[in-house]
Structures are given as C-alpha cells and as structure tokens.
C-alpha cells in the first residue's frame, strides 16, 4: 500500500522539516526559517510559535518540531502546552480580577497559585484545635475535647462529653 | 496573525508622564479583557493593571493606583497606559497582554503579548 500510495502520490516521501513544493513540481523542499513540520507528507510548513513577553523560550523551534514555552517567573503556565500564564501571589492570597488579595479570615492558602480555602473544622471530627490557622497555613488539629480533659484515667470518671459540633473557643 | 504591538516608551524624568499604546490585529478586541504587565530589570513580571471589554471596569496593582490609567478604544483596536507621577521605581518594560477565553471566569491568564516597550524613568 505504502509503494502504491508514494507512485500516486511523490509528496508522501517527503520527510518531517520538509514540505512539498507545489511550485516546484512537488519537489521536497525544506521549511523556510521559523516554520516546522513535525510529519512527513505535509504540503506546507507551520508558523513556530513565538514565546515572547509574558512567555519564554523552553525549547527552540526546529524545522522538525515547534517551540516549547513556559511563563517568565512571576506568572505560572495554565493550559495544555503552556496555552495561558497566570500571576503569581503569595501564600497567604488569592488571585483575583483585582490583583492578587489576602486570603479573608477563616481561609488559607500555601501556595502561589490557586484560592484561599477554608480552614479544617476540627470539630466535624470531634477533634479540637491544637494549632490555629493563619493566612498561609490550615489549623492543626489534635486530639478530642474528651482525651484533653485532666484526670481522665481507669481511677478517675471521664468527664463529660461536649456537645457534638462545638469546639473550645 | 494575532498580535500586539506596543509603543510609547522612553527615557523621562521622575514626575513626569508617558502614555503608551498597543496595537491589536488578527482578533476582535472588544471580546477581551486586556491588561499591562511590567518586568523591572532583573526582576520578575509583575501585573500592573486590567480593563474589561467594554472599558466599565478596570483595575490596578496598588503601587500605580491613582498615577497610571487604562484606556482601550475598540474601534481603533487599540489599548493605552497613561502613566503620571512616574518613579526610578517604575523602570521596566511594560507588555501589553490579552486575558484568555474565560478570563475572570475560571482563571486569569494571559495568551497573548508582545515584545514591549522600554519605559526609562531616571534624571
């Protein structure tokens, strides 16, 4: 099938980084500077992508394959082969049509990327809070309300259970 | 092709104004939210500012707050920077940049910029 498809068709032997000249008697001829084909048979070149402001060069463009970019530091890429760069902020923010803001109380973020999210309700678990939040950091939660209590030992009665859904303020 | 071209830029002294531009061919502006980027010398790119299609909201980084104004007018194709009251600290080159389909949406990047414009500020 192959030598039947190349006698029909004398483009089909053009190799990748080549393109058949229809000017030129269906000639291979190589892609012209900033143009790549990736696969042989093509009958044009594609225009190599330009990685240039919010974008930087990860991988030169060759005449067999197209340029590679990810974003310049201070944005992130986003997207399939780097389609978009997004900004950057700190922990402790999230990313808004505004700029960059501080996480609201009650929610955190520890990378630069991404929402603020709230913070664990150890509670939901009957834990308590060993270590509270912060902007950057989720709380850390310990051990039950009941396992904190003083004395409580096989000697000495437990105390009493808290309510379910309440934690130490 | 999409593209955007900037220009504008210069050498001026502190307190003094620049207004920059930025040509758009090969899309339709008014479906994009626009913004300017900036990168100081040996520093990273920072966001300065954004404006929706339509021009009705716009947006600053806060250290150009009340100095620098983004403008677009689609039929000219064409985005602006005012800047006033210019800083040593706002030397860099400044990018004019296109937010990407669902920008504001479900993220905010950029798909599209150019090759910038060099803005100067010294004595």
């Known amino acids: 099938f192959e030598r039947t498809r190349s006698l029909q068709d004398p483009c089909s032997n053009c190799p990748a980084g080549t393109f058949c000249d229809n000017n030129r008697n269906q000639i291979c001829s190589p892609c012209p500077p900033n143009s790549f084909s990736s696969a042989g048979g093509q009958r044009t070149c594609d225009i190599c992508r330009q990685c240039k402001g919010v974008f930087r060069t990860r991988k030169e463009c060759s005449s067999t394959s197209n340029a590679e970019c990810d974003c310049t530091p201070g944005f992130h890429c986003l997207g399939a082969g780097c389609s978009m760069c997004e900004q950057d902020c700190k922990q402790g923010q999230e990313l808004t049509k505004k700029g960059c803001k501080d996480c609201c109380f009650g929610t955190f973020n520890d990378q630069k990327r991404g929402i603020c999210r709230p913070w664990t309700n150890c509670s939901l678990d009957g834990k308590s809070v060993l270590v509270n939040g912060t902007k950057e950091r989720d709380v850390v939660c310990g051990p039950s309300p009941a396992d904190l209590s003083p004395g409580a030992s096989s000697v000495t009665p437990p105390a009493p259970a808290r309510e379910p859904g309440h934690s130490p303020q | 092709q999409v593209q955007l071209v900037e220009s504008g830029g210069g050498l001026v002294q502190p307190g003094g104004s620049l207004r920059l531009s930025c040509a758009a061919t090969?899309?339709?502006?008014?479906n994009y939210w626009m913004n300017w980027v900036r990168q100081a010398p040996g520093k990273g790119l920072e966001w300065?500012?954004?404006?929706?299609?339509?021009?009705?909201?716009?947006y600053y980084v806060d250290s150009v707050k009340g100095r620098f104004t983004i403008s677009r007018d689609n039929a000219k194709s064409s985005l602006y920077l005012q800047m006033s009251s210019l800083r040593a600290e706002d030397t860099a080159v400044y990018f004019c940049?296109?937010?990407?389909?669902?920008?504001?949406?479900?993220?905010?990047?950029?798909?599209?910029s150019g090759q910038g414009t060099t803005v100067t500020v010294s004595s």
């Open positions: 940049a296109r937010g990407g389909e669902g920008y504001g949406v479900d993220h905010y990047g950029l798909d599209v």
């Open positions: 090969g899309f339709t502006l008014s």
């Open positions: 300065v500012a954004n404006i929706n299609q339509d021009g009705s909201e716009r």
